[in-house]
Interface confidence: low
């Protein structure tokens, strides 16, 4: 017998399948496997080019040998041979393409008796009308329940004819289904039109949750209405818990704003927190074997019906690529004010930022910046340097986002841009900055502080100066003195008090004449060199009733240093038991260079201190 010439064949999807006429295997049994090729589903197909004396037993062949047969070759086989092939494919659990299944089904012209022996998915392609009797249809649809209905697209004729036949077989009249009906329908339940969803929500909604493909418009509307109605099994959205959200996850994309707004907010927050951090929760995307670039290209198109018409809560259920594809950047920019109220995950915020970056490569306009909200936390200092922020409202809005946290590099950059834009640290700005960051003022260098106008000092609160060092107070005190100059004594002291760490001796002397009753905390923050020249009487007047506190502080600066400069008998007049003053009969001469140059005596400063004992006897003096 002459062998036909081998020629390359195309299997389904146009991929090279077998390099030989595989029908020889099935009809004549003349060929044997030798070398292997990779099949499109990842299983290996083996071309057959040996010659056998006797036709083989198909069931003895390996899955590798059974894979990838082209339809054209099956059409030449007898019905019996086709049935034998189908059974072998089932036994070996060989995964077939839609094209191959359709082809086999076509050749099984008579309804097979042994449905259980055939590949499950093959049944989807058989005509259900061939199983019309109650027993036959029950047997047929019981098997169909276990098949992967999604091999067929929703619009495929084979799929469209299955649901009505299944409903008829199970004796379903009208749109009311029992739990058993839904179970019996298997994957076909995902095709039930909206009227079934409306009437059988209790048993159908839990099934729709796990439908792999998106629901059609009719089903979505019915599901939304049923969920909003608050009937079983989920109850009113206002009572939903995290486990309800988990149970509903496949239906979350169909929830409208009214439903989302009535779910307890803490529950949405808790659920999103968990679902965004727990990758094991997420439903695995169905694996489709296709080249990577094809998948990426497909993801750039927004799925039908998902184009965002406004920025609202429904977007929290979009995957990242859907946000990228379905949210228009210009729409996002005009509705930025809504983003802050929507619980996007950090990953989703990344996508939104990317969209804005593409729309505004030179930096965002202030209208967008003002409404960034939590998206501000996604900005880098480099992003912020591109901005021109002039409105105090914008500054406040962004500082609010970072409230309660340390000043971040982003915030520091934002403030720097804002202040530089204004040219000086005016009162309103200072007021705002110190409200958010009480230590802000003390983080500036003396040079930067010199640009603060005296009028801005009115915004400074005592706590804003807590961390300032003497160099900074030296700059701020003269400004404060100028700012408060028109106030009367007691009011003036209240305002100037927290700046006194920068006050010179003469101002402290002046204050001592005004009965101000300075507290010890303020006194302890005064410059040591400003306190040293004060007399005991002046300190007593300055502190008023608080003078008693000196005893507790006698070992701390500036009190310690001041005591060393006072005559002991002067200190004794205070009646506080202060010790360490200059004893009677001693004269202290400070011969330091510092005094020679500045005129300021510095008992403990650098330079030699000469203490001379002078016998101050009247007779000697005489």
């Amino acid at each position: 017998m002459a062998l036909p010439t081998a020629r390359p064949l195309l299997g389904s999807c146009g991929t090279p399948a077998l390099g030989s006429l595989l029908f020889l295997l099935f009809s004549l049994g003349w060929v044997q496997p030798s070398r292997t090729l990779a099949g499109e589903t990842g299983q290996e197909a083996a071309p057959l080019d040996g010659v056998l004396a006797n036709p083989p037993n198909i069931s003895s062949l390996s899955p590798r040998q059974l894979l990838g047969f082209p339809c054209a070759e099956v059409s030449g086989l007898s019905t019996e041979r086709v049935r034998e092939l189908a059974v072998a494919l089932a036994q070996k659990n060989v995964k077939l393409s839609t094209e191959q299944l359709r082809c086999l089904a076509h050749r099984l012209s008579e309804p097979p008796e042994d449905l259980d022996a055939l590949p499950l998915d093959l049944l989807l392609f058989l005509n259900p009308d061939a199983f019309s009797g109650p027993q036959a249809c029950t047997r047929f649809f019981s098997r169909i329940t276990k098949a992967n209905v999604d091999l067929l697209p929703r619009g495929a004729p084979e799929r469209q004819r299955l649901l009505p036949a299944a409903l008829a077989c199970w004796g379903v009249r009208g749109s009311l289904l029992s739990e058993a009906d839904v179970r019996a329908l298997g994957g076909l339940a995902c095709d039930l039109p909206g009227r079934f969803v409306a009437e059988s929500a209790e048993v159908l909604l839990p099934r729709l949750v796990s439908c792999p493909g998106p629901l059609d418009q009719d089903q979505q509307e019915a599901a939304r209405a049923a969920l909003q109605g608050g009937g079983p099994p989920y109850g009113p959205p206002s009572t939903w818990s995290v486990s309800t959200m988990d149970a509903l996850r496949g239906l979350l994309p169909v929830l409208g704003q009214p439903i989302i707004r009535s779910i307890p907010q803490g529950i949405v927050a808790a659920w999103r927190q968990r679902s965004s951090r727990d990758p094991s929760w997420r439903q695995p995307e169905r694996t489709i074997l296709r080249p990577r670039f094809r998948r990426e290209v497909e993801k750039t198109a927004c799925p039908s019906g998902k184009k965002a018409r406004e920025i609202d809560e429904s977007l929290i259920f979009y995957k990242k690529w859907e946000l990228e594809a379905c949210v228009d950047a210009a729409l996002l920019a005009t509705q930025m004010d809504r983003v802050n109220a929507i619980p996007f995950t950090y990953e989703q915020l990344d996508v939104l930022k990317h969209k804005l970056d593409e729309l505004y490569p030179q930096g965002y306009p202030e209208s967008v910046i003002q409404h960034l909200g939590y998206l501000f936390l996604k900005m880098s200092p480099e992003d912020i340097r591109k901005w021109n922020v002039t409105s105090l409202e914008t500054l406040k809005a962004l500082l609010e986002v970072n409230k309660g946290h340390e000043m971040s590099p982003q915030v520091a950059t934002l403030i720097d841009r804002f202040v530089k834009g204004r040219g000086q640290l005016d009162k309103d700005t200072l007021d705002t900055l110190t409200a958010f960051y009480p230590g802000y003022l003390c983080s500036l260098s003396p040079e930067e502080l010199s640009s603060v106008p005296p009028s801005s000092i009115w915004a400074v609160r005592p706590q804003d100066l807590d961390t300032c060092d003497p160099r900074q107070l030296d700059v701020l005190y003269p400004k404060a003195r100028l700012a408060f100059q028109n106030m009367n004594g007691s009011e003036y002291f209240v305002k100037i008090q927290s700046f006194l760490g920068g006050a010179p001796t003469e101002d402290l002397k002046a204050l001592s004449q005004q009965n101000v009753s300075m507290d010890l905390a303020t006194f302890m923050k005064l410059r040591t060199d400003a306190v040293l020249p004060l007399t005991v009487a002046e300190v007593q007047k300055l502190l008023g009733p608080h003078v008693e506190g000196l005893k507790a502080e006698e070992r701390h600066r500036p009190v310690r240093d001041w005591i060393l400069r006072q005559r002991q008998d002067d200190l004794d007049t205070l009646g506080l038991g202060l010790q360490g003053g200059i004893p009677n009969g001693y004269l202290v001469l400070d011969l330091s260079m510092q005094e020679a140059l500045s005129g300021t005596p510095c008992l403990l400063g650098p330079g030699p201190v000469l203490t001379v004992l002078a016998l101050l006897l009247a007779s000697t003096l005489a």
Epitope: P264, G266, I267, A269, Q273, A341, I342, P343, Y374
Partner: nanobody, 117 residues
Framework: EVQLVESGGGLVQPGGSLRLSCAAS????????MGWFRQAPGKGRELVAA????????YYPDSVEGRFTISRDNAKRMVYLQMNSLRAEDTAVYYC??????????WGQGTQVTVSS
């Protein structure tokens, strides 16, 4: 301005219990969901409990389910976290949080809980 102040943290032996309290003040009312996060050294923040405003709807992750109980007293503006059967892995700084626009946007300063023998 919303302020949340936690208390009740400390050192406890494995198997022991602690009750954390959180006092809410400022421009807040009882209509917000509240919760507790924790952050162990070198790890991210983890939500360990949440409770809704006017109902007993609560949330716990599997790691603390059955051991931790969150409750609130709206009148006193207090939220509590009762922690039983404490384990070494519960050692963390615990933060009280208040919901803000579907997210837990307001945070306390945190209180340290150390479980060690």
């Amino acid at each position: 301005e919303v302020q949340l102040v936690e208390s009740g943290g400390g050192l406890v032996q494995p198997g022991g219990s602690l009750r954390l309290s959180c006092a809410a003040s400022g421009s807040t009312s009882g209509i917000y969901a509240m919760g507790w996060f924790r952050q162990a050294p070198g790890k991210g923040r983890e939500l360990v409990a949440a409770i809704n405003s006017f109902s007993d709807i609560t949330y716990y992750p599997d790691s603390v389910e059955g051991r931790f109980t969150i409750s609130r007293d709206n009148a006193k503006r207090m939220v509590y976290l009762q922690m039983n059967s404490l384990r070494a892995e519960d050692t963390a700084v615990y933060y009280c949080v208040r919901e803000r626009g579907y997210n837990f946007g307001y945070w306390g300063q945190g209180t340290q809980v150390t479980v060690s023998s």
